[in-house]
């Protein structure tokens, strides 16, 4: 029998390489059974995760999974950092792994690097 616990499917030590000025959707895949939990996003500041208030968020439903989406419209250089989603379920808080946004400020780049070039940046690969 499948568990009816809420599960948040963000991979540990995952990351996204994105560009300032672009729109971006950060998805938190949520599995639940009967009642959709309340889900929030926060941004890590050291060891504290600061809840993101007043941000554009939305839900997307797929057949076995729902996605709680944090919208960046557009991405700003200050959006660089690690994010976590959490679900409030039966008075318990379930936290996802954090996922990191690496923001490239296109103003400081002479031209947009390709995804392969992004992937070769040593502070992404080796940190």
């Amino acid at each position: 029998k499948e568990s009816c616990d809420v599960q948040l499917y963000i991979k540990r030590q995952s990351y996204h390489s994105i560009f300032a000025g672009d729109p971006f959707k950060l998805e938190c895949p949520v599995k639940y059974c009967a009642h959709r939990p309340q889900v929030t996003w926060c941004k890590l500041n050291g060891t504290t995760c600061v809840k993101l208030e007043g941000r554009h968020t939305s839900w997307k439903q797929e057949k076995n999974l729902s996605f709680f989406i944090l919208h960046f419209e557009p991405v700003l250089p200050s959006d660089n950092g690690s994010y976590r989603c959490s679900a409030n379920f039966l008075s318990a808080i379930i936290e996802s792994h954090s996922t990191t946004l690496y923001v490239t400020d296109v103003k400081s780049a002479s031209e947009r690097p390709s995804k392969d070039e992004m992937a070769s940046r040593p502070w992404l690969l080796y940190s």
């Epitope: 060891t47 992937a119 690969l125």
Partner: antibody
Framework: QVQLQESGPGLVKPSGTLSLTCAAS????????MYWVRQPPGKGLEWIGR????????RYNPSFKSRATISADKSKNQASLKLSSVTAADTAVYYC????????????WGQGTLVTVSS | DIVMTQSPDSLAVSLGERATINCKSS???????????LNWLQQKPGQSPKRLIY???KLDSGVPDRFSGSGSGTDFTLTISSVQAEDLAVYYC?????????FGQGTKLEIK
């Protein structure tokens, strides 16, 4: 259950490129991380790097500098390793492995393939 | 890089006896999520490695309960409470906290 099968040439010439493929069954690789480890004959294990097949993002061991390239094909449920500019020191058994990216609930290694670098 | 150092390099144990393998990391393996990503692998002769233990002390499914893991921070131990003939293998610790992932040099378990 989760299974992995590595394939590729067992002999590569010095300065050439080693190319290996790892086919997964019993799991959708987009829910995993896939990684490569090598073991020179009679020696210990060395981590080469890993890929998130969901988005193609990679992490590498800096000791491989820019020689290693890991890629994944979600439609074929497989990952690949390319190692360029090989020398005799790259002779090893190469293992691919896969683990649950969310909860670490499984970690499975392939059977390994011996690659010899020699002219 | 985190350096993983195992001790001893090899040990010979009689059937039914306890075997203890130590693993020390050059820095703490406690991650920011409060978990410690320390794994133990078993590699039997001529075979590929198999994960025995993850998150310091969690046993993989199908692993006999004579195997146990313990420790925290930088010091970890794999214990086999009653060694069996099929436990003849090389055992590796490895860390999954920081990149690049790193392995101990291995400990060869022999049967007396």
């Amino acid at each position: 259950q989760v299974q992995l099968q590595e394939s590729g040439p067992g002999l590569v010439k010095p300065s050439g490129t080693l190319s290996l493929t790892c086919a997964a069954s019993g799991v959708n690789i987009k829910d995993t991380y896939m990684y490569w480890v090598r073991q020179p004959p009679g020696k210990g294990l060395e981590w080469i790097g890993r890929i998130d097949p969901a988005n193609g993002y990679t992490r590498y061991n800096p000791s491989f500098k820019s020689r290693a390239t890991i890629s994944a094909d979600k439609s074929k449920n497989q990952a690949s390793l390319k190692l360029s500019s090989v020398t005799a020191a790259d002779t090893a058994v190469y293992y691919c492995a896969v683990y649950d990216g969310y909860y670490e609930s499984f970690d499975v290694w392939g059977q390994g393939t011996l690659v010899t670098v020699s002219s | 890089d985190i350096v993983m150092t195992q001790s001893p390099d090899s040990l010979a144990v009689s059937l039914g006896e306890r075997a203890t393998i130590n693993c020390k990391s050059s820095q703490s393996l406690l991650d920011s999520d409060g978990k410690t990503y320390l794994n133990w692998l078993q590699q039997k002769p001529g075979q590929s490695p198999k994960r025995l233990i993850y998150l310091v002390s969690k046993l993989d499914s199908g692993v006999p309960d004579r195997f146990s893991g313990s420790g925290s921070g930088t010091d970890f131990t794999l214990t086999i409470s009653s060694v069996q003939a099929e436990d003849l293998a090389v055992y590796y610790c490895w860390q999954g906290t920081l990149f690049p992932r790193t392995f101990g040099q291995g400990t060869k378990l022999e049967i007396k």
